[in-house]
């Protein structure tokens, strides 16, 4: 038979020969021959390979550098890389999470729509009419204006997106 031009799934072609790929978590030591199967070895302690492969070296696990605000979210195995996330109050600057930045705060007049996570920043929204925020915060939502009526009071000073209303006593008509 003619030598192959393509091989089966999880195989690779070398020297007119189909050889089995190494399974995830293992690296290639020697190619197969017609008599001997591909020789593979497990990756070391801090290494991984996440696909069927013919790599002669395993990849190093990602290092979650605390100096960059990183910490380990999920420890790597021989088949998976380490997943980093950011310390409390910080979030990743990219999908690869190679460094962290402090969560942004929402300025007065804006409230937190979505609290930041290790991988996403704070999402702020302007306080709509009837709501206010008078602080710069990464957690505080817009608060509703105080309802003077329910306290049997009247509005003495209108609220804004940054300030609450000011309530005061009602002027009573003297008899």
């Amino acid at each position: 038979p003619e030598p192959p031009t393509a091989c089966r799934e999880k195989q690779y072609l070398i020297n007119s020969q189909c050889c089995s790929l190494c399974q995830p978590g293992q690296k290639l030591v020697s190619d197969c021959t017609e008599f001997t199967e591909t020789e593979c070895l497990p990756c070391g302690e801090s290494e991984f390979l996440d696909t069927w492969n013919r790599e002669t070296h395993c990849h190093q696990h990602k290092y979650c550098d605390p100096n960059l605000g990183l910490r380990v979210q999920q420890k790597g195995t021989s088949e998976t890389d380490t997943i980093c996330t950011c310390e409390e109050g910080w979030h990743c600057t990219s999908e690869a999470c190679e460094s962290c930045v402090l969560h942004r705060s929402c300025s007065p007049g804006f409230g937190v729509k979505q609290i930041a996570t290790g991988v996403s920043d704070t999402i702020c929204e302007p306080c709509p009419v009837g709501f206010f925020s008078n602080v710069s915060s990464a957690f505080e939502k817009c608060h509703p204006w105080t309802s003077c009526e329910t306290k049997d009071l009247v509005v003495q000073q209108a609220g804004t997106n940054k300030t609450d209303v000011v309530c005061g006593p009602q002027d009573r008509l003297r008899a």
Epitope: P1, P4, Q11, C18, C32, E34, F35, E37
Partner: antibody, heavy 125, light 115 residues
Framework: QVQLVESGGGVVQPGRSLRLSCAAS????????MHWVRQPPGKGLEWVAV????????YYGDSVKGRFTISRDNSKNTLYLQMNSLRVEDTAVYYC??????????????????WGQGTTVTVSS | QAVPTQPSSLSASPGASASLTCTLR?????????IYWYQQKPGSPPQFLLR?????????GSGVPSRFSGSKDASANAGLLLISGLQSEDEADYYC?????????FGGGTKLTVL
């Protein structure tokens, strides 16, 4: 290490039967095609038969077709050669040999690398 | 079955080179054939030396010295076993082997004498 050990040889009369066995060790027997090759006294090598790694196919040399049957038991890591209607010209040392692995493209069309020490079959009246 | 043709004997001196031929009959193209070579010493089973298909597709047997190499002579439709730096322990019978029509065929063998 890789080892093939043949057994079952002996002296037998023409027309009788004999079954040879070959015990394999040191490798994944079920991954390899296996052959029987014989060598008459003072003569060259003659191929007898091959069986695929999974037993799905067998081929035979012209001189033994219809009389000899190659088989294998992968659970016992053992290769067999059932020899019927033996003839004087079947007298030879019979070698069990390892063929190509199943990972090959058409792996059964590859050669043989490991040989046993052989077992002697003498057919004589 | 078509048996490859090998010269029955060959003599050479220690340190010299020897070229053993395995001629295929017409109809079997040496160019596309895998040719296997085996060495057999008296009282021992054959040992796999090498398989040669082309310079980019060859296989050396485990522990076989690089003094043993394969080649082909397309014009003679023959496979070649080349042994350089002959040593006394190279004295043995040498067999070539091919697949043809779903059967294995061995050459008749060459007896190499190292004088």
């Amino acid at each position: 290490q890789v080892q093939l050990v043949e057994s079952g040889g002996g002296v037998v009369q023409p027309g009788r039967s004999l079954r040879l066995s070959c015990a394999a060790s040191g490798f994944t027997f079920s991954s390899h095609g296996m052959h029987w090759v014989r060598q008459p006294p003072g003569k060259g090598l003659e191929w007898v038969a091959v069986i695929w790694y999974d037993g799905s196919n067998e081929y035979y040399g012209d001189s033994v077709k219809g009389r000899f049957t190659i088989s294998r038991d992968n659970s016992k890591n053992t290769l067999y050669l059932q020899m019927n209607s033996l003839r004087v010209e079947d007298t030879a040392v019979y070698y069990c040999t390892r063929g190509g692995g199943h990972w090959n493209y058409e792996g059964h069309y590859y050669g043989m690398d490991v040989w046993g020490q052989g077992t002697t079959v003498t057919v004589s009246s | 079955q078509a048996v490859p043709t090998q010269p029955s004997s060959l003599s050479a001196s220690p340190g010299a080179s020897a070229s053993l031929t395995c001629t295929l009959r017409s109809g079997i193209n040496v160019g596309s054939s895998r040719i296997y070579w085996y060495q057999q010493k008296p009282g021992s089973p054959p040992q796999f030396l090498l398989r040669y298909t082309s310079d980019s597709d060859k296989l050396q047997g485990s522990g076989v010295p690089s003094r043993f190499s394969g080649s082909k002579d397309a014009s003679a439709n023959a496979g070649l076993l080349l042994i350089s730096g002959l040593q006394s322990e190279d004295e043995a019978d040498y067999y070539c082997m091919i697949w043809h029509s779903s059967a294995v065929v061995f050459g008749g063998g060459t007896k190499l004498t190292v004088l």
